[in-house]
Interface confidence: medium
């Protein structure tokens, strides 16, 4: 509450997060022309990345393009990309949607379709839908521990969200345990009125707001965090503005002295921890 | 404008960026003692990194040290590093400029020069100039989509820079389209009065400032972002303070059961998105 | 000092860091059943990661699990994890502490102990203590250059912590050189009253606070930074809340067409650069 006689100061904050959980992923794997069901285990080193600061990312879905090599090949025949003759293909042209630079030739992509040849990582990435349901949909049961250290330098006051009296096997609940700083990812979504299973397919951004409203006067001292959750990406966003949350990264390797890469398009949830508030003192 | 009767509140912000573009890189490649011109394509997975939050990085230039192995070798003969006898080399000494730990021996680097032997990743990195012009100078034509979600918790007000009415094929222009949030990298530099081609060689830091001056009173409601651009690194910086922007990273691999690495010194532009402003309400 | 007649404005800040230093690491290496002492050199590409913004990380210790493959194996026999029959193992169960998904079988881990079989990256990570003393304890002598560009947009004022008159071979000292922005990591810890050698074992988070108290009136202009240091993680934290600072990451590779990984549990110091302050002008 506003105490007008107090000197207010904004919070200086540092955040540390730790995600826990294992996902079992079942997907079709093609090897030597034979497709079979493959099972694999993803642990924190597989689905999250060493990130600093006020964000952490949990991969919930992916599309892989394996064994790409730098060469010439037909580009992917997405809407409007097909050609019937070389006239349609412009040497040196880089279509922002494409994954390479056109050579000027129109070549067969498969038995029925022709596309412009490109210099690119080949075969070019197929523009297929993200798997549905999401491959790591069980990430809903992962938990994240959030440690938050705050400081009001002008008042020379420091505290943190985790107190010595807290129990490390708790799980945050708005009513039963609002001070616990271990959060189940599915609960964060539920609190924000969002469906984890749905968002996990295309990815998204979720805000975890930590609000410190601190009264630092000795006679009525109070300084504990309040947690709230809200979705930060626009779920109604137009296709052209890239809905959801994904990024591409590559694993490079050499095979028979040829540089190759596996391209991974990773969809997932980026959690942004937004710490704000003030410390007031007479 | 300052309305003194209003209660002002600082903005809470979350940013998501998406870079698009392909670069064709031509450089000399030496293999089996033969140097020839190599062409390669760089897409987002090659020139940018999965980063969180208010920064993104675009690699515009690089120097590679391939096939390094942990062993003993002469250090690079940079200015002041040459020796004529073992007396000049101090066992266990780590010169901050060097890349290894001295063994105490003075050994031939090439036919004309001797340097102190070091325990290091060998051969040690050659301290050569960044290629000029920059290898990925065409990054000037890349575009970045910036999504910004803001919140004034005290006023319980949330909005974003991208509105449903916006067109996903626009490009930001200060006069013609100041609300479009897709920016051509070259335009950002031009707006900031900087030369992309020049900065791309050594790298640099560019600030994209998003200013929200929000009047949240219903009778004169206004809350849209204003974009501006300024260079954040010091282009006149003394050599000793490391001008430009670069970092080193490594790709590790095994060859004949020996651990090796390729060291990449990546130069590029780090874009910092600085969101600020206030929301005022009676 | 507070000048009530001034219009105060919070600082907008951008930070760039550059770490320098080499560490020699000596550890036991087992190959072909023979254990011998291995020496290796770590440079910036080995112990730090390309990070953006207001944080940088220096690895000071690590535990490696080499050559893991996805298969079935007994889980690590940590406290409470042993079994005597299949009844104790629940098919499909994921113990948050475990590294895999139980198959329902109780199998021998070694001659004396049995544990539940899991589908996981095998062999599962041994839960051994971080090496003591820390493997990269010599990181105490590394230095970091911190470049800080600040802006008060309302006052249209920009400056930076590094001035043209500064000497690039200085080292920060609270008394002798309080404006030098090159910091020895060990000195940062000393200033904060912490023991680097101790913290390096489990890792931790160190805050570097940069306070700008700027008077922008022309007749009494002053705008220089003041540096201070404080530990941000809780050194007295209960085991269950994961004391120190570490994260796991993996290096993936293929051997005989089998996907493998080396898992690295990296302990280290995350340095958070916390920039705050105000610019006041009549």
């Amino acid at each position: 509450s506003d105490k007008l006689y107090q000197r207010k100061e904004p919070v200086i904050s540092s955040v540390h997060t730790k995600v826990k959980g294992i996902a079992e992923v079942t997907e079709n794997v093609t090897e030597g022309g034979v497709t079979k069901l493959g099972h694999s285990i993803f642990d924190t080193a597989d689905y999250t990345f060493p990130l600093q600061g006020n964000s952490f990312f949990v991969m919930t879905n992916y599309v892989k393009s394996e064994g790409q090599v730098q060469t010439l090949c037909p580009e992917y025949p997405r809407r409007g990309a097909q050609c019937s003759s070389d006239r349609r293909c412009k040497k040196g042209w880089m279509d922002p949607q494409s994954k390479g630079i056109q050579t000027g030739r129109c070549v067969p992509y498969d038995k029925t379709r022709k596309t412009c040849e490109v210099s690119a990582w080949c075969p070019t990435e197929e523009e297929k839908e993200a798997p549905r349901p999401a491959l790591l949909r069980s990430a809903e049961n992962f938990t994240v521990l959030i440690k938050n250290n705050i400081h009001f330098p002008g008042h020379n006051y420091t505290t943190r969200n985790i107190l010595p009296t807290m129990n490390g096997s708790c799980t945050f609940h708005k009513t039963w345990d609002p001070q616990c700083s271990i959060f189940r990812l599915g609960d964060i979504f539920q609190e924000a009125g969002e469906n984890f299973t749905e968002v996990a397919v295309q990815g998204g951004i979720m805000g975890i707001e930590i609000y410190w409203d601190c009264n630092l006067d000795s006679w009525s001292h109070h300084c504990r965090p309040r947690y709230s959750f809200r979705r930060l990406d626009d779920k109604n966003m137009d296709e052209s503005f890239v809905p959801g949350y994904n990024f591409r990264y590559a694993k490079y390797y050499k095979e028979n002295n040829v540089e190759k890469r596996t391209l991974i398009k990773a969809f997932g949830i980026r959690f942004d921890i937004l710490v704000f508030g003030t410390g007031g003192k007479f | 404008s300052d309305k003194l009767y209003q209660r002002k509140e600082p903005v809470i912000s979350s940013v998501h960026t998406k870079v698009k573009g392909i670069a064709e890189v031509t450089e000399n490649v030496t293999e089996g003692g033969v140097t020839k011109l190599g062409h390669s394509i760089f897409d987002t997975a090659d020139y940018t990194f999965p980063l969180q939050g208010n920064s993104f990085f675009v690699m515009t230039n690089y120097v590679k040290s391939e096939g390094q192995v942990q062993t003993l070798c002469p250090e690079y003969p940079r200015r002041g590093a040459q020796c004529s006898s073992d007396r000049r080399c101090k066992k266990g000494w780590m010169d901050p400029q060097s890349k290894g730990i001295q063994t105490g021996r003075c050994v031939p680097y090439d036919k004309t020069r001797k340097t102190c032997e070091v325990s290091a990743w060998c051969p040690t990195e050659e301290e050569k100039e960044a290629p000029r012009p920059a290898l990925l100078r065409s990054a000037e034509n890349f575009t970045v989509l910036i999504k910004n979600n803001i919140h004034f918790p005290g006023h319980n007000y949330t909005t974003r820079n991208i509105l449903p009415t916006m067109n996903g094929s626009c490009t930001f222009h200060k006069t013609w389209d100041p609300q479009c949030s897709i920016f051509r990298l070259g335009d950002i530099f031009q707006e900031a009065g900087e030369n992309f081609t020049e900065v791309a060689v050594q790298g640099g830091i560019m600030g994209i400032e998003i200013y929200w001056d929000c009047n949240l009173d219903s009778w004169s409601h206004h809350c849209r972002p204003r974009y501006s651009f300024r260079r954040l690194d010091d282009k006149n910086m003394d050599e000793s303070f490391v001008p430009g922007y670069n970092f080193r990273y490594a790709k590790y691999y095994k060859e004949n059961n020996v651990e090796k690495r390729t060291l990449i010194k990546a130069f590029g532009i780090r874009f910092d998105i600085l969101v600020f402003g206030t929301g005022g309400k009676f | 000092s507070d000048k009530l007649y001034q219009r105060k404005e919070p600082v907008i800040s951008s930070v760039h860091t550059k770490v320098k230093g080499i560490a020699e690491v000596t550890e036991n290496v087992t190959e072909g059943g023979v254990t011998k002492l291995g020496h290796s050199i770590f440079d910036t590409a080995d112990y730090t990661f390309p990070l953006q913004g207001n944080s940088f990380f220096v690895m000071t210790n690590y535990v490696k699990s080499e050559g893991q493959v996805q298969t079935l194996c007994p889980e690590y026999p940590r406290r409470g994890a042993q079994c005597s029959s299949d009844r104790r193992c629940k098919k499909g169960w994921m113990d948050p502490q475990s590294k895999g998904i139980q198959t329902g079988r109780c199998v021998p881990y070694d001659k004396t102990r049995k544990t539940c079989e899991v589908s996981a990256w095998c062999p599962t990570e041994e839960e051994k203590e971080a090496p003591r003393p820390a493997l990269l304890r010599s990181a105490e002598n590394f230095t970091v250059l911190i470049k800080n560009n600040i802006h008060f947009p309302g006052h249209n004022y920009t400056t930076r912590n590094i001035l043209p008159t500064m000497n690039g071979s200085c080292t920060f000292h609270k008394t002798w050189d309080p404006q030098c922005s090159i910091f020895r990591l060990g000195d940062i810890f000393q200033e904060a009253g912490e023991n680097f050698t101790e913290v390096a074992v489990q890792g931790g988070i160190m805050g570097i606070e940069i306070y700008w108290d700027c008077n922008l009136d022309s007749w009494s202009h002053h705008c220089r930074p003041r540096y201070s240091f404080r530990r941000l993680d809780d050194k007295n934290m209960d085991e269950s809340f994961v004391p120190g600072y570490n994260f796991r990451y993996a290096k993936y590779y293929k051997e005989n067409n089998v996907e493998k990984r080396t898992l690295i549990k990296a302990f280290g110091i995350r340095f958070d650069i916390l920039v705050f302050g105000t610019g006041g002008k009549f």
């Epitope: - | 059961n257 | 072909g32 059943g33 893991q68 021998p108 062999p123």
Partner: nanobody, 127 residues
Framework: EVQLMESGGGLVQAGGSLRLSCAAS????????MGWFRQAPGKLREFVAS????????RYIDSVEGRFTISRDNTKNTLYLQMNNLKAEDTAVYYC????????????????????YGQGTQVTVSS
């Protein structure tokens, strides 16, 4: 010093079976993974099958999967290889070896991870 003695080889017709044994002496090998390797004339020594120290996990080269079975009896310090439906390409000298490590799960097929002390036993499959 460990001694390994292979036995059970011989001449057999295609489609037939053999059971190889490997007796260890000198020290107990029950703490170690163990494996069978083979070497055909003019070829490199290749991995055939391996079993971890407890006998719970087994690994095979693709060409023998489903035809060969590796097993061990730790009370007798003995390793076995049951070979069914033999083919002409199985002709080779078969060696038994014990695994030195590290990491059996990952390196079970790598000859440099084993110590070979046996003389080998010849298996000839006639078509």
């Amino acid at each position: 010093e460990v001694q390994l003695m292979e036995s059970g080889g011989g001449l057999v017709q295609a489609g037939g079976s053999l059971r190889l044994s490997c007796a260890a002496s000198g020290r107990t090998v029950s703490d170690y993974g163990m494996g069978w390797f083979r070497q055909a004339p003019g070829k490199l020594r290749e991995f055939v099958a391996s079993i971890n120290w407890s006998g719970i996990y087994t690994r095979y080269i693709d060409s023998v999967e489903g035809r060969f079975t590796i097993s061990r009896d730790n009370t007798k310090n003995t390793l076995y290889l049951q070979m069914n439906n033999l083919k002409a390409e199985d002709t080779a000298v078969y060696y038994c070896a014990y695994f030195l490590g590290p990491n059996w799960y990952s390196n079970y097929g790598r000859p440099s991870s084993y110590d070979f002390y046996g003389q080998g036993t010849q298996v000839t499959v006639s078509s």
